[in-house]
């Protein structure tokens, strides 16, 4: 808390400038009027003040708008913006994305601090939704930011934020969150056609049933084998070896490098000898010929 | 600079369990999503389980659905693992992953091996 003493003669501000640098604290809490500091915010940020002379003009916001600062303050807080607490963010009513924009370049670089997160969830609460706009400036700034979120969270998601989603945005999702994005992606790109439709959606297959694999592949999509490891092993297993192969086209090769690992190793021990010896990959593990295959899931669901 | 370090992993018999844990420190926030994976003899890296920073909701995958259960005390930034009934296909090097929205942290990996 900065004492209130009487500006000296001749150093009240007129306009907020460089030679408020060399202003002591005291001086710049009596001799700064709050509102005229309000209208100048673009200017701070120019100017090297120490942290402890933004304290003192922070004060003065502080006074001037006790229940939060408006907007047109807000978009120019610059560093100000880092001295913000939660609590001093939780009164602001951010609706414009240019502000948003503007507070998340002070903090570029950064790991997301409490005063982002609150920023953002304030921006979004306001919103009702995490829109596509408002996705693509997070993602931009966060490339991090979906994986992070809860499926609850992702589920608020609307289909039409999709547009905004890259594949490296999703480079780091589990299969629990990548299960709640698929459906929005496979609605959000529906009306594209084949191979355009595969490409949208090639990073959002982790979520993938296995009625739409089988749909894939009869589309000659020719799925690489990065994209067939990250699919849900019980989206794959009920695959039959003509599908998986109509499904990699060309990259069907790929299969015999990755016989070990799952979801491959677990698919090869549901498929017949016979039908995995038709690749000619030498893939080993099938069922042997002759042997009967008794589902007893499906018997356990008939009782 | 942010660190993450796991702790817990040994030799245990089939059936036997065992409880691994993982230590964030540095400045990682609220926002962030801890998972574990594990890296098999046979060099695949696969996910095991999440734990979300909102209402703590989990994520496990089918193999372990049912043994593994993931839990997290966001106020120490630690998270662990108990893992129950273990098998010897759960054998591999268990690696602790922190996703906040900007970076993803991984941690240098506990070995577990199930066997008689």
């Known amino acids: 808390e900065v004492e209130k003493t009487a500006c000296p003669s001749g150093k009240k501000a007129r306009e907020i400038d460089e030679s408020l640098i060399f202003y002591k604290k005291w001086e710049l809490e009596a001799c700064v009027d709050a509102a005229l500091l309000a209208t100048q915010m673009d200017r701070v940020n120019a100017i090297p003040f120490t942290y402890e002379q933004l304290d003192v003009l922070k004060h003065k916001l502080d006074e001037l708008y006790p229940q939060g600062y408006p907007e047109s303050v807000i978009q120019h807080l610059g560093y100000l913006f880092l001295k913000m607490s939660p609590e001093d963010i939780r009164k602001w009513n951010v609706t414009s994305l240019e502000t948003l924009k503007a507070l998340l370049e002070v903090n570029k670089g950064h790991e997301m601090s409490p005063q982002v997160a609150t920023l953002i969830d304030r921006f979004v609460k306001g919103r009702g939704q995490l829109d596509k706009d408002t996705l693509d400036t997070l993602t931009a700034f966060y490339p991090g930011y979906l994986c992070s979120l809860s499926p609850e969270e992702l589920s608020s998601v609307p289909p039409s934020s999709i547009w905004a989603v890259r594949p490296q945005d999703l480079d780091t999702c589990d299969p629990r969150q990548l299960d709640v994005l698929y459906p929005k992606a496979r609605l959000a790109f529906q009306n594209m056609n084949g191979s355009e439709y595969f490409v949208k959606i090639q990073s959002f297959l982790g979520g993938a049933p296995t009625e739409d694999l089988k749909a894939l592949s009869q589309q000659n999509v020719s799925m690489d084998l990065a994209t067939f490891m990250k699919l849900r092993t019980d989206a794959v297993l009920p695959l039959t070896v003509a599908e998986v192969q109509k499904l990699l086209g060309p990259h069907v090769e790929g299969l015999k490098a990755e016989e070990r690992h799952r979801p491959v190793r677990d698919w090869i021990l549901r498929q017949r000898q016979d039908d995995l010896d038709t690749l000619g990959l030498g893939l080993q593990g099938g069922i042997p010929n002759g042997y009967l295959v008794l589902d007893l899931s499906m018997q356990e669901a008939l009782s | 600079e942010v660190q993450v370090v796991e702790s817990g992993g040994g030799l245990v018999q089939p059936g036997g369990s065992l409880r691994l844990s993982c230590g964030v420190s540095g400045s990682i926030l609220a926002l962030n999503t801890m998972r574990w994976y594990r890296q098999t003899p046979g060099n695949q890296r696969e996910w095991v389980a999440s734990?979300?920073?909102?209402?703590?909701?989990?994520g496990y995958a089918d193999s372990v659905k049912g043994r593994f259960i993931i839990s997290r005390d966001s106020a120490k930034n630690m998270m662990s693992l108990q893992m129950n009934s273990l098998k010897s296909e759960d054998t591999a090097v268990y690696y602790c992953?922190?996703?906040?929205?900007?970076?993803?942290?991984w941690g240098q990996g506990t070995q577990v091996t199930v066997s008689s």
């Open positions: 734990i979300y920073s909102s209402g703590g909701s989990t």
């Open positions: 992953n922190v996703q906040t929205p900007l970076n993803v942290y």
